[in-house]
Every structure is written in C-alpha cells, then in structure tokens.
C-alpha cells in the first residue's frame, strides 16, 4: 500500500509539473474581477457610465476560452481526487498574493471549489485552500 501511495504521489507530482494551470488562474481572476470596484466603491461617488462597455465585457470570449482550456487541464486529474486537490491548492497559492482583501479571497476560494463541477468533473471532498490574503511574503 505504501509503495502504491509513493507511486501515486510521484505520478501526481509529474502530472502537476506537466499541467498548465494558468488558464484556470486567468479564468478565475476574470470571473471575480468583473468590476474590481464593486467591493471598494465609495457609495457616494458616481459610478461609471452604465452605457460604456467595461474592459471585462470586451474580454468575455477570452474568459470562456480560458475556462475551456482550464477544464482540459483539470481533466487530467479526474481519476485522482487528492491530486485534483493539490492542483486547486497550487492555483490558490499562485494567486493568493494578488488578493489583498478577505472578500476577494473568499470569493476566489468559492469559485475555485466550484471549478471541477463547472468542468463536469468530481470535486475533491476535503480540500484545504486556506491562506491569508497576501499569500507568503515573497518579496
């Protein structure tokens, strides 16, 4: 059993190294950042012209393209729930220092947990995605 787990870990490691998780990160960030100001907008300041297209609207097609590519990548982890969780953890770690607010972090986590399901894949039952906003102090 130990031998099998060791092989499984090695296989997961090489899968993670081969995988390109960037499309997933791009898809998620575009999803939660449609309007960055929706979290921090001063309620007393006038909002942007509702008739002018937002940068996100112009990138809508790009986002679905990211999602498709992301799902293709996650598909590789379909038969290994623990490895799927590690892939999600890696996405969280790669983006955690971009999220400088609790709400942003929680929303990103929510979307990340839903990602396998959005791709028609099984979501890992227990997968700890905890990091504090700002990630590790990399600088």
């Amino acid at each position: 059993r130990q031998q099998w787990e060791l092989q499984g870990d090695r296989r997961c490691q090489s899968q993670l190294e081969r995988a390109n998780l960037r499309p997933c990160e791009q898809h998620l960030m575009q999803k939660i950042q449609r309007d960055e100001d929706s979290y921090g907008r001063d309620p007393y300041s006038p909002s942007q012209d509702p008739y002018s297209p937002s940068p996100y609207d112009r990138r809508g097609a790009g986002s679905s393209q990211h999602q498709e590519r992301c799902c293709n990548e996650l598909n590789e982890f379909e038969n290994n729930q623990r490895c799927m969780c590690e892939a999600l953890q890696q996405i969280m770690e790669n983006q955690s220092d971009r999220l400088q607010g609790r709400q942003q972090e929680q929303q990103f986590k929510r979307e990340l947990r839903n990602l396998p399901q959005q791709c028609g894949l099984r979501a890992p039952q227990r997968c700890d995605l905890e990091v504090e906003s700002g990630g590790r102090d990399r600088y």
Partner: antibody, heavy 118, light 110 residues
Framework: EVQLVESGGGLVQPGGSLRLSCAAS????????MHWVRQAPGKGLEWVSA????????YYADSVKGRFTISRDNSKNTLYLQMNSLRAEDTAVYYC???????????WGQGTLVTVSS | IVLTQSPLSLPVTLGQPASISCRSS???????????LDWFHQRPGQSPRRLIY???KRASGVPDRFSGSGSGTDFTLKISRVDAEDVGVYYC????????FGQGTKLTVL
Amino acid sequence: EVQLVESGGGLVQPGGSLRLSCAASGFAFNDYTMHWVRQAPGKGLEWVSAISYGGTNKYYADSVKGRFTISRDNSKNTLYLQMNSLRAEDTAVYYCAKDSGYRSLLHWGQGTLVTVSS
Amino acid sequence: IVLTQSPLSLPVTLGQPASISCRSSQSLVHRNGYNYLDWFHQRPGQSPRRLIYMASKRASGVPDRFSGSGSGTDFTLKISRVDAEDVGVYYCMQALQTWTFGQGTKLTVL
C-alpha cells in the same frame, strides 16, 4: 463614506522615534490590506509599507526595512507605523491608504507631516 | 521594479489632448493575465486619487476623457481634452512586486 485620518506626525530629532496612527471608518477595516505611502516636500510618492488584513503578512520598501514596523489593531480600526532610527530623508507627508482588494490603492487619507531635523 | 515616466513636465493648452508614458524595468503582466499598473492624479495640496487600475480600467467616478493603455513594460495615460481641473502631478504605480511609483509628470495648463 470611507474615511482615513492620519495622526502622530510632528518634529523629531535624527535617530529618534515616532508612531503614526491611521483611524479608519466607513468600511470593513479587517477585510482589507492597508498601506503607508510618503511624499517628501516637493517630491514624488514613495510606497513605504503594507499589511494584510489579518496582520500576518507585512511588506516594506528597502529604504525603511529594519527601521519601520507596520501593525494594525482590527478591534480599533486603526493602522500604525512605528518609525525608529529616523533620518532627515524620512521627512515627508505620510499617507495611509486602503487597498482595493486587488493590490490597488483605492482610498487615501489627507496625510500627516513628519519632520526629522535637529 | 523601476518605473520611468516621460515627460516629467507637460504644458498643455486647454481642450487639447495630452499623453504620459510609463516604462517599467520588467514586465508587469502577472501569470493571471492582468497588467499590474495603476495611474494616480494629485492636485496641488491634495491627496492622490486613483484614475486607472490594471493598466486600462477606469476607476469609479473618473471622467471618460481619461484612458489607460499598454501591456508588459510600456504604458500610456491619455487625456483626450485637457480641462483646467486636470492640472497637477500624474503618477504610474506598479503592484506586481510589492508597490513602486514612477517619479511623476507635472501637467500645467497654458
């Protein structure tokens, strides 16, 4: 309405210490990274330090590393900057700023002036 | 990361367009596809105010005569028609690695 009010500035001798405070209101203070940015008289903006919403992660500009300490008290909605071993080049208006949640400085205070001189 | 703005001084006639450049010592594109570059405006005696974030997104309440463009290392802030209230100093800021500002561009009206 988001309000950030800095205090604690003043005249201090080189080598001395000072603690700046920033009282925040109008938003969930414990949900956002907060920053200190300074501006020397007649000069440009210089980012000084930032602290994540729970206070775990702290970031510093090289020019203040080891001398300045950023902290926050979420129960008091207050951000602090402890400044030690002050130098003449630390003379500036110090602004407190709230992060948008995506690494952008969305709201700024009016600033407090720190003068380091003998 | 070092940001270099040009010009440092920009005299403009009212109603005319203006353009400020900001060049970064390294690419500001994160792996998530976003450019971590913002633009700020500071009027004399006032605190800075955010105009543009993520290189091209106009902040809430900012007039549509302001626009940001660029990617990687080269970025531009454009004002389509300069107004009297646009005087002051404009700063670019990178947020890819910690945070740093450009040296500022002083816009004056002729």
